[in-house]
């Protein structure tokens, strides 16, 4: 079975900015991809960014880069300062999408700790 | 403007062959998944096969595996159903749709459709 | 596979009435279903997708709602145009599957 794993690291240089990694365990080739916060997307969630192989990137503020790292994974950088920025306990949501397969989504968020978390 | 032409449907015997054709026109058609759907005599709607946009994955509703073949040419942007083995129960309208990506796969444009009979 | 439990099957209104159909899957879909719109001796046509989100030229008195497991949709002032059968379908796990269809019928 696919699964979905999220990374949610604090930098220690900006100590509001947060990098968000999320990557696609699974055979199938992704459609899509839909980082969200606060909750997943259609459960009270709000779009970072939505990712796609072919057609390009889009992505909305406070996300200031999302890229792809590999064909199965994505970063995402968000800015630090203003009111919409997140906060430590802040849930992070990334969904992948495969085509004929479905949809996989997993949420993360800051570990207690400063180390960087895993969670699927 | 966006178009999905059906055919290749008719009357066949029971346990006959016939192969189905989409010709699309107005996108890409090579960047976008399709699906052949039959809508039954009693008017419910299957997903009877579905292929991914560069043809490497595919679908199949279980009661057509073994019997139908999804395939694609997207050098002449056609898509195609080929049926074996045909059963009664194969009996319906069938269309071709497109699948859009940013709409969580839902089918944006769906063809006028072709009838298949399967008779006895 | 998961299934779609749509109801009522038939919905006989006038028109400038509210209505509202219900779509219910087996299993949580997150907010993968569209709703479609099949007028008579046409092929079905999209209305909404992930769940809320209306397609283009889609008039706003069509209304989608729902999250998980359970899934509305509603036309808040019926037309006489609005003569359809609707379907809800769920796009999240495949075999990608549809509800029976509700039958809307403009006394």
């Known amino acids: 079975t696919p699964e979905v794993w999220v990374q949610v690291r604090m930098e220690a240089t900006e100590l509001s900015s947060f990098t968000i990694r999320c990557g696609f365990l699974g055979s199938g080739s992704i459609s899509l991809v839909t980082v969200s916060w606060g909750g997943p997307n259609g459960a009270g969630g709000t779009t970072l960014a939505v990712l796609h192989p072919e057609r390009g990137i889009r992505q909305w503020a406070p996300a200031r880069q999302a890229r792809w790292e590999t064909q199965s994974s994505i970063s995402l950088i968000l800015e630090g300062s203003g009111a919409s920025s997140p906060c430590a306990n802040t849930t992070f949501c990334c969904k992948f999408a495969s085509f004929p397969e479905g949809s996989w989504e997993a949420c993360g968020s800051l570990p207690p700790s400063s180390d960087p978390g895993l969670s699927a | 403007d966006v178009k999905l032409v059906e055919s290749g449907g008719g009357l066949v015997k029971l346990g006959g062959s016939l192969k189905l054709s989409c010709a699309a026109s107005?996108?890409?058609?090579?960047?976008?998944?399709m699906s052949w759907i039959r809508q039954t005599p009693e008017k419910r709607l299957e997903l009877v096969a579905a292929?991914?946009?560069?043809?490497?994955?595919?679908y199949y509703l279980d009661t057509v595996k073994g019997r139908f073949t999804i395939s694609r040419d997207n050098a002449k942007n056609t898509l195609y159903l080929q049926m074996s083995s045909l059963k009664s129960e194969d009996t319906a309208l069938y269309y071709c749709?497109?699948?859009?990506?940013?709409?969580?796969?839902?089918?944006?444009?769906w063809g006028q459709g072709t009838s298949v009979t399967v008779s006895s | 596979s998961i299934v779609m439990t749509q109801t009522p099957k038939f919905l006989l209104v006038s028109a400038g009435d509210r209505v509202t159909i219900t779509c219910k899957a087996s299993?949580?879909?997150?907010?993968?279903v569209a709703w479609y719109q099949q007028k008579p001796g046409q092929s079905p046509k999209l209305l909404m997708y992930?769940?809320?989100n209306h397609y283009t030229g889609v008039p706003d008195r069509f209304i989608g709602s729902g999250y998980g497991t359970d899934f509305t949709f509603t036309i808040s002032t019926v037309q006489a145009e609005d003569l359809a059968v609707y379907f809800c379908?769920?796009?999240?796990?495949?075999?990608?599957?549809f509800g029976g269809g509700t039958k809307l019928e403009i006394k």
């Open positions: 749709a497109r699948h859009e990506d940013y709409y969580g796969f839902a089918m944006d444009y």
């Open positions: 107005g996108f890409t058609f090579s960047s976008y998944h």
């Open positions: 292929i991914n946009s560069n043809g490497i994955n595919t």
């Open positions: 299993q949580s879909v997150t907010n993968d």
């Open positions: 992930y769940v809320s």
């Open positions: 379908q769920q796009a999240y796990r495949s075999p990608w599957t």
